[in-house]
Interface confidence: medium
């Protein structure tokens, strides 16, 4: 089976405050089985932004229908961006288990927030 790749094609995305940010992420294989999660930042201080299995995440919507079994697009849209949302976002595949374990991470997309146009 093909080795899983997590593709985050945008190195950075710049969005005006108040707008929505789309963060792209696709995977190249359905294996191993397990959820996708999005985090802002890396390491112990990282913040969970979206979890395919949990919720709700009021400001986050998925671009594709992630509940479909064959879905490989895990891009998300974050609404009403504020300066506090700035940071690097990682799309991470987890392997199913008790608990789920981190399997592979995308390269990250840096979100910068511009001042709201007057």
């Amino acid at each position: 089976e093909e080795e899983l790749q997590i593709i985050q094609p945008d190195k950075s995305v710049s969005v005006a405050a108040g707008e929505s940010a789309i963060l792209h992420c696709t995977i190249t294989s359905l294996f191993p089985v397990g959820p996708i999660q999005w985090f802002r930042g890396a390491g112990p201080a990282r913040v969970l932004i979206y979890n395919q299995r949990q919720g709700p995440f009021p400001r986050v919507t998925t671009v594709s229908e992630t509940t479909k079994r064959e879905n490989m697009d895990f891009s998300i849209s974050i609404s009403n961006i504020t300066p506090a949302d700035a940071g690097t976002y990682y799309c991470i595949k987890f392997r199913k288990g008790s608990p789920d374990t981190e399997f592979k991470s995308g390269a990250g997309t840096e979100l910068s927030v511009r001042a709201k146009p007057s």
Partner: antibody, heavy 119, light 108 residues
């Protein structure tokens, strides 16, 4: 103006080594990911290797993995490609290419340096 | 790995004519596609990125279109400097970054 100047090409025998350099100027070198792209005689462009601005992230094409090593010295604004165990099929013009800061396309290229591997 | 197929391999046209170059991706690359021009003895030059955005300093006779798997580079009226080899490159699926095989635009 951005300038990328490759050097170090030449004629070598199969199995030998060569080190290419790319001297960069006109931009903040350490802020940009850099790549090597090659073009064999009469052929198209082939991506060879990528190194992130900090040097922490590195990728290689399968055709050179285990034989070529990309590196950079940000204090000297220089990109390198160490090529070992050279083969005839490595004969090409090697270009140094600067990535755009948002996406992985190449907005600046050097003129290239020719590497010929022949017995 | 995403394979890019360019067609035709060679395009023979006269100055002033319109050139249409095609690039097909083996899987969707959305709009993450760039076009380059390569003249003999010169460094490749970025023409188009994001499938349709002209790079700085590129004349408006060059235009790009398409998304997903089908892309087109159009040169509305060929000038002498435009006779060269053109490559498409995808930067969605990486690594490896992949290029098409090239289309040579030659004088008829």
């Amino acid at each position: 103006d951005v300038q990328l100047v490759e050097s170090g090409g030449g004629v070598v025998r199969p199995g030998e080594s060569l080190r290419l350099s790319c001297a960069a100027s006109g931009f903040t070198f350490s802020s940009y990911d850099m790549n090597w792209v090659r073009q064999a005689p009469g052929e198209g462009l082939e991506w060879v290797s990528l190194i992130s601005g900090s040097g922490e992230i590195i990728y290689y094409a399968d055709s050179v993995k285990g034989r070529f090593t990309i590196s950079r010295d940000n204090s000297k604004n220089t990109l390198y490609l160490q090529m070992n165990s050279l083969r005839a099929e490595d004969t090409a013009v090697y270009y140094c290419a600067k990535e755009n800061n948002r996406y992985r396309f190449f907005d600046d290229w050097g003129l290239g340096t020719l590497v010929t591997v022949s017995s | 790995e995403t394979v890019l197929t360019q067609s035709p391999g060679t395009l023979s046209l006269s100055p002033g004519e319109r050139a249409t170059l095609n690039c097909r991706a083996s899987q969707s690359v959305y709009s993450y596609l760039a076009w380059y021009q390569e003249r003999p003895g010169q460094a490749p030059r970025l023409l188009i990125y994001g499938a349709s955005t002209r790079a700085t300093g590129i004349p408006d006779r060059f235009s790009g279109s398409g998304s997903g798997t089908e892309f087109t580079l159009t040169i509305s009226s060929l000038e002498s400097d435009d006779f060269a080899v053109y490559y498409c490159q995808q930067y969605y699926d990486r690594p490896p970054l992949t290029f098409g095989g090239g289309t040579k635009v030659e004088i008829k």
